[in-house]
Interface confidence: low
Amino acid sequence: MRTEAQVPALQPPEPGLEGAMGHRTLVLPWVLLTLCVTAGTPEVWVQVRMEATELSSFTIRCGFLGSGSISLVTVSWGGPNGAGGTTLAVLHPERGIRQWAPARQARWETQSSISLILEGSGASSPCANTTFCCKFASFPEGSWEACGSLPPSSDPGLSAPPTPAPILRADLAGILGVSGVLLFGCVYLLHLLRRHKHRPAPRLQPSRTSPQAPRARAWAPSQASQAALHVPYATINTSCRPATLDTAHPHGGPSWWASLPTHAAHRPQGPAAWASTPIPARGSFVSVENGLYAQAGERPPHTGPGLTLFPDPRGPRAMEGPLGVR
């Protein structure tokens, strides 16, 4: 029996509305407009499976639902990569695949999805509540990351009936279903806009979740403008860390991570702008990454009450901009 957890990675925020028009007339068109605008926004899905016959064997599958070309995929466990997570595998379309124990087999399934088999025994083996994260770097969307773990109820030792949910079916159903709804919605929206084109259009309230013009890193693919800041839906569960993570190292997470001020989420990317004030470049658990904020010191969009910002232990590497010539 396989148990699996499919994690929806992104949740588009709802822009506020302001204007003299009645809500009944406007809510649907503007919700549809939001859907149409964000329809092209990439998403990352993560699926974690555990084989009942091999309790220490996990299969992680990740996919990127976007139009851009993928330049790199990083799979980690124990939390987001660079935020307490341990790198398990790196898949590069041209350079190849690198994997680290207990990863046994990492491979590309399609041009936009990968799978990773973990095997371990004793200290190096994952356990049921380990969090697995996948980060996709793509052009022009930037970096997107989502995490997933087996739900507590998915203990393969339980005599629950098997749940062979075909991933292909789920993916296609989701893609086709959403695409169909969006297509219909967009057509309907155009219809409504044509009917109401003589009316004054309501102003969109400046949303606090709208990022400034993105600034790409010197070494990263430039990121296309995003309509909104998307926060992945994922639970960081590090209560079961690999026993090999015993010595003090950059991943040891101080308890004050959770109270990190939101303006510390990103680091300015100038050659020396961050020299005296180390702030993580990819510290936040936010899907859109490659340079969301126009200037250092600018307060980034409000990330919501449940979002924890994770400093990047790759201080040495995460923040360099043009200093590291690639």
């Epitope: 190849g96 190292h249 232990p313």
Partner: antibody
Framework: EVQLVQSGAEVKKPGASVKVSCKVS????????MHWVRQAPGKGLEWMGG????????IYAQKFQGRVTMTEDTSTDTAYMELSSLRSEDTAVYYC????????????????????WGQGTTVTVSS | DVVMTQSPLSLPVTLGQPASISCRSS???????????LDWYLQKPGQSPQLLIY???NRASGVPDRFSGSGSGTDFTLKISRVEAEDVGVYYC?????????FGQGTKVEIK
């Protein structure tokens, strides 16, 4: 246990190129992040560049940009460092270095953890 | 680049006695995650460098406990509680906070 064995000493003329090899044993090259560090006679250590596993690319110190190329042959688990347009000040011992897979680098997040070093390759640039 | 300055450049020591080497960086090496990105290496005569201490105060695998690292921000110290004959060589500090990582000039430890 990771072990690194480097190629033998080289004598080159100014303007020429040198290619130093570093053979990995104990692990496959694809599991490691290889760095190259050099040491001029009587001088200190100088990092030249290395592989960044997250970005899947090799990063070079700006000082060597355009002159150094670090490559890998995964079929033989051998890393190479080629330095072109040699000058007399490039006379040095060149080391490859990586992590032993039991340090923090093996867990991601710390790519300059170099606890396994090759024996060094002496490159002499002289006319 | 971050400039690393070591002192003293030469340190004559007595066997069995403690020794201390200082390393100062031009920029703080304390990262927001609470770790200091400073390593210590020892290069024994005629050998390749070997890692002693990483992230400021963590002994690398196989390193005797007579070696200890301390300090934070820009000032760091490597201490040898009781110097042994095999400890002679050149000690280097290295910052790993910024690309490129940079080394100090080295401190040569020799027996008096």
């Amino acid at each position: 246990e990771v072990q690194l064995v480097q190629s033998g000493a080289e004598v080159k003329k100014p303007g020429a190129s040198v290619k130093v090899s570093c053979k990995v044993s104990g692990y496959t090259l694809t599991e490691l992040s290889m760095h190259w560090v050099r040491q001029a006679p009587g001088k200190g250590l100088e990092w030249m560049g290395g592989f960044d596993p997250e970005d899947g690319e090799t990063i070079y110190a700006q000082k060597f940009q355009g002159r150094v190329t670090m490559t890998e042959d995964t079929s033989t688990d051998t890393a190479y460092m080629e330095l072109s347009s040699l000058r007399s000040e490039d006379t040095a011992v060149y080391y490859c270095a990586t992590d032993s897979r039991d340090g923090p680098a093996a867990r991601g997040g710390y790519y300059y953890y170099m606890d396994v070093w090759g024996q060094g390759t002496t490159v002499t640039v002289s006319s | 680049d971050v400039v690393m300055t070591q002192s003293p450049l030469s340190l004559p020591v007595t066997l069995g006695q403690p020794a201390s080497i200082s390393c100062r960086s031009s920029q703080s090496l304390l990262y927001i995650n609470g770790y200091n990105y400073l390593d210590w290496y020892l290069q024994k005569p005629g050998q390749s460098p070997q890692l002693l201490i990483y992230l400021g105060s963590n002994r690398a695998s196989g390193v005797p406990d007579r070696f200890s690292g301390s300090g934070s921000g820009t000032d760091f110290t490597l201490k040898i509680s009781r110097v042994e004959a095999e400890d002679v060589g050149v000690y280097y500090c290295m910052q790993a906070l910024q690309t490129p990582p940079t080394f100090g000039q080295g401190t040569k430890v020799e027996i008096k």
